[in-house]
């Protein structure tokens, strides 16, 4: 028979997206065994009838990857899950409704951080997504996100930072003392989304000026 | 050397629909964003519309939404503006523009629409 | 929409005069301001991008400052070829939008 309450068996399912990968995940509840299983459904907000997600039928992890089966930007989704313990009881949880670019977050940004004599150059690798374009490409977030920007700090000393910012991929803080330590942190912004990745981190000494010498 | 050529311009009644095309060369068409921005006579630049070239992804201002359409041919190298249900005030010189590393420093010559009866 | 609002919209000067222009943005775009010169009969073209850097092959004459909310675009010593109408536009979030214009003219 079914239990009382579903969370009972099964609780806290939801989608956690980072970058368009798009995890289902759940927890099992207090009454939750590991010899539990859980199946996956999906479907796309609008449609009638759930699809059975292969790879995610009775299994005992607690996570199954719907990034292909929810990879339309412009669609919602829903996923559910049913557990089934091994006693026969089951209860099913729907996760809320599910958009890539409402609710995926930004990972830091590959960067490349290149040091000379008084100046340091940051270079940004666009992010791939797993998001095919129609000739087969994979998607970067800036093909995703037209008002993406890139924000950049140089910690120069306790007291001062300098910032640079915008939606070239190539950067360089000049006025630099030679051979000295500096921490740069480089985000990903979307102002529209209200998106902002962790940042990169890169400790680079300026090279000695060897011109004294 | 980055060229932006449009076309398709011309007079139009009213109510009436009109294709510009915009050819583009030297550069990568295919991973890039593409801009139709107009100008009515006299009076000042508006963004009209954008394209990723890869994803597909558009946005529109306010004012022509669910009436023009921004696409491409990423194998003719060519954008293209689908303007349906015309209006006087759509009366401007359209021109396509892009973006590349970073920055919206290339724009066509301009072709004029002329919405009137 | 963010709203920029420009001024003046025209002005007259003389030639080697300091010419300065403002634009005020609606709401933050933090440095997110290009400055563009458009001529009678051409399409617009880039001179400032992100507040302050300048494109290439444009004069140094030409300098931009601001952020946040409030921004300059200042021509050091107006020349003959500087007679134009010129725009700021934001490009923090779409729509772009376009400041009204200030035409500079020869007094």
């Known amino acids: 028979h079914a239990p009382e309450d579903p969370s009972d068996l099964l609780q806290h399912v939801k989608f956690q997206s980072s970058n368009f990968e798009n995890i289902l995940t759940w927890d099992s509840g207090p009454e939750g065994t590991p010899d539990t299983v859980y199946s996956i459904e999906y479907k796309t907000y609008g449609e009638r009838d759930w699809v059975a997600k292969k790879g995610c039928q009775r299994i005992t992890r607690k996570s199954c990857n719907l990034t292909v089966e929810t990879g339309n930007l412009t669609e919602l989704y829903y996923a559910r899950v049913t557990a089934v313990s091994a006693g026969g009881r089951s209860a099913t949880k729907m996760t809320d409704r599910f958009s890539s670019l409402q609710h995926t977050t930004l990972k830091p940004p590959d960067v490349t951080c290149i040091s000379k004599v008084r100046s340091i150059q940051m270079i940004v690798h666009p992010t791939p997504t797993p998001i095919r374009a129609g000739d087969g490409h994979r998607l970067t977030l800036e093909d995703i996100f037209h008002d993406l920007f890139y924000h950049l700090e140089l910690q120069v000393n306790r007291t001062y930072q300098m910032h640079l910012g915008g939606k070239q991929r190539e950067y360089e803080f000049f006025g630099l003392t030679p051979d000295t330590e500096f921490l740069g942190t480089i985000m990903i912004c979307v102002p529209t989304w209200a998106k902002e990745s962790a940042p990169y981190m890169c400790r680079v000494k300026t090279l000695p000026d060897r011109t004294w010498t | 050397e980055v060229q932006l050529v449009e076309s398709g311009g011309g007079l139009v009644q009213p109510g009436g629909s009109l294709r510009l095309s915009c050819a583009a060369s030297g550069f990568t068409f295919s991973s890039s964003w593409m801009y139709w921005v107009r100008q009515a006579p006299g009076k000042g630049l508006e963004f009209v519309s954008v394209?990723?070239?890869?994803?597909?992804?558009?946005h529109y201002v306010e004012s022509v939404k669910g009436r023009f359409t921004i696409s491409t041919d990423n194998a003719k190298n060519t954008l293209f503006l689908q303007m349906n249900s015309l209006k006087s005030e759509d009366t401007a010189v359209y021109y396509c523009?892009?973006?590349?590393?970073?920055?919206?420093?290339?724009w066509g010559q301009g072709t004029q629409v002329t919405v009137s009866s | 929409d963010i709203v920029m609002t420009q001024s003046p919209s025209s002005l007259s000067a003389s030639l080697g005069d300091r010419v300065t222009i403002t634009c005020q943005a609606s709401?933050?775009?933090?440095?997110?301001i290009d400055w563009y010169q458009q001529k009678p009969g051409q399409a617009p073209k880039l001179l400032i991008y992100g507040t302050s850097r300048l494109e290439t092959g444009v004069p140094s004459r030409f300098s931009g400052t601001g952020s946040g909310t409030s921004f300059t675009l200042t021509i050091s010593g107006v020349e003959a070829e500087d007679l134009a109408t010129y725009y700021c536009l934001q490009d923090y979030s779409w729509p772009l939008t376009f400041g009204q214009g200030t035409k500079v003219e020869l007094k």
């Open positions: 709401q933050s775009i933090r440095s997110f």
């Open positions: 523009a892009t973006r590349i590393q970073g920055l919206i420093d290339y």
């Open positions: 394209i990723n070239t890869r994803s597909g992804i558009t």
